[in-house]
């Protein structure tokens, strides 16, 4: 039975040209996290973080994505095209797969604030 819950940073906004941290957290389960996949709204992979083998950053993002903090991902040099949904997929044993959603809005305005609160989708 899957008892865990994915908490995410929810809906966040950040300034064009700036950076943002995409973060998910799995709680309420003793399951072992074997791998976390980060994907964009169009199903393109940004990164994979295997518990033992470390990070894999996809070549399309290698100049703009930094691993971490933790199992999260830092997206840099933001463009307007980065606006959209991002998904963290936690592969766990023995529970199976958990998925969290983050919506990022990239703003032209200099008043854009990066909210870092955690939300349960």
């Amino acid at each position: 039975m899957m008892t865990g819950t994915i908490e995410t940073t929810g809906n966040i906004s950040a300034k064009k040209g700036g950076s943002v941290i995409l973060q998910c957290h799995l709680s309420s389960t003793m399951a072992q996290v074997t791998q976390v996949n980060w994907e964009q709204h169009d199903h393109s992979l940004l990164a994979i973080r295997n518990a033992e083998l470390g990070w894999h950053i996809y070549p399309a993002f290698k100049d703009r994505v930094a691993p971490g903090p933790g199992l999260g991902l830092t997206l840099q040099s933001l463009t307007m095209n980065d606006t959209g949904e991002y998904f963290c997929t936690y592969h766990t044993y023995p529970d199976g797969t958990y998925r969290g959603r983050i919506f990022l809005e990239v703003l032209e305005s200099s008043v854009a604030e990066h909210s870092a609160r955690f939300q349960i989708p």
Epitope: Q35, S44, L45, N50, E52, L53, H56, K62
Partner: antibody, heavy 119, light 107 residues
Framework: QVQLVQSGAEVKKPGASVKVSCKTS????????MHWVRQAPGQGLEWMGG????????TYNQKFQGRVTLTVDKSSSTAYMELSRLRSDDTVVYYC????????????WGQGTLVTVSS | DIVMTQSPDSLAVSLGERATINCKAS??????VAWYQQKPGQPPKLLIY???YRYTGVPDRFSGSGSGTDFTLTISSLQAEDVAVYYC?????????FGGGTKVEIK
Amino acid sequence: QVQLVQSGAEVKKPGASVKVSCKTSGYAFTEYTMHWVRQAPGQGLEWMGGINPNTGGTTYNQKFQGRVTLTVDKSSSTAYMELSRLRSDDTVVYYCAKLLRLMYYFDYWGQGTLVTVSS
Amino acid sequence: DIVMTQSPDSLAVSLGERATINCKASQDVRTAVAWYQQKPGQPPKLLIYSASYRYTGVPDRFSGSGSGTDFTLTISSLQAEDVAVYYCHQHYITPWTFGGGTKVEIK
């Protein structure tokens, strides 16, 4: 230049164990995970598992779980693969292979080690 | 485990002609696919990574495409030195798996 040099061919009896070494040079050994891939004669490739030399953390193909042990010796930049309870179908070539940095692709391979299991 | 099914098993192509190898994953692996070339008595060599990126030093006659479950390796103009076995490989989730291989020969 990067080199992965494996130990020589081995002949073992069923039920025995074999330990294959992979001595590396030309790169920072602890910064790249090392993997083992095997290939039966004239057959395809099979991933056995990988090890993070920095932490010693391992990930195994469940097919080999309990029979394979991956270790490293950081002082000599050498990786090891030990396979126990050998069977005749373990008569294959074993390769070590390192990953690219921050990418899950094998960019350098050892020359291969043939292990023959025969009574 | 994700099964990678390659087709055809073998392929005979005239020098200078196009060779096309297909790989089908049993489930969606996004673009987490590489292609390797293996010549007799040698270890495999990386050709294509992330489905479509050519590895350093690989001739531009080699190209890769696809995402999800269907992937293709194309040799646009076959050369004698391209005679080898080609393998696809997925790393979307462990255990990482390879296709059964496609042997490319000269017709």
